[in-house]
Amino acid sequence: SETTTGTSSNSSQSTSNSGLAPNPTNATTKAAG
């Protein structure tokens, strides 16, 4: 058994069930028209 508060996650999507959003580091902010 384990009780953990985890560590900060910066990884992007890896496996099909990772649950992570893509979170691309190169995404640029673009105002909606």
Epitope: G6, T7, S9, S18, L20, P22, N23, P24, A27, K30
Partner: antibody, heavy 117, light 113 residues
Amino acid sequence: QVQLQESGPGLVKPSQTLSLTCTVTGYSITSGYTWSWIRQPPGKGLEWIGYIQYTGSTRYNPSLKSRVTISRDTSKNQFSLKLSSVTAADTAVYYCARGTTASFDYWGQGTTVTVSS
Amino acid sequence: DIQMTQSPSSLSASVGDRVTITCRSSQSLLYSSDQKNYLTWYQQKPGKAPKLLISWASTLASGVPSRFSGSGSGTDFTLTISSLQPEDFATYYCQQYFIYPLTFGGGTKLEIK
């Protein structure tokens, strides 16, 4: 079938710490996905609080990061939310949900937390 | 943070009507690596948790009736209900599942006319 169930006190005093637990059945929280907390103030929209991934890593909404801790107890297949220094603005329905790579596909029924003295 | 804007905020319609709800994001949700739009739609009824309807802008979740459809790309998206049924009267939320922090639109409340 995957099911999530929130539990915890329905009333918390201002400045205290809100503590909620989500019990997951039908899937091991260490097998995959992210496990999130989301809240909804009365009559308002949804706000993502943060997640704990199956690996144990966490990520929090920067708007709440200084006050939030999400942890897990793998022996009970539960994950928990702690929100410190609460105010009336933290009054909301709190949901736990499973995150896939594209959506929240399973949700708990929600638990109402009122912050009041 | 990515801002999600839904319109209208409320809408009155009748059973059998065709209804369209729009959602606009402050940043493109199109991921160049897989050419998918990370836009999700949920339905919420009073006192209940949100229910997943559509992911990747247009992929219907399991068990969701085919009268629901999603479209759009980049920053502009729509949810369409082709023929409203009594059980469809609810609040609908869009969400970007692209960049953290994940954010939701303000919701569109669909009411009976």
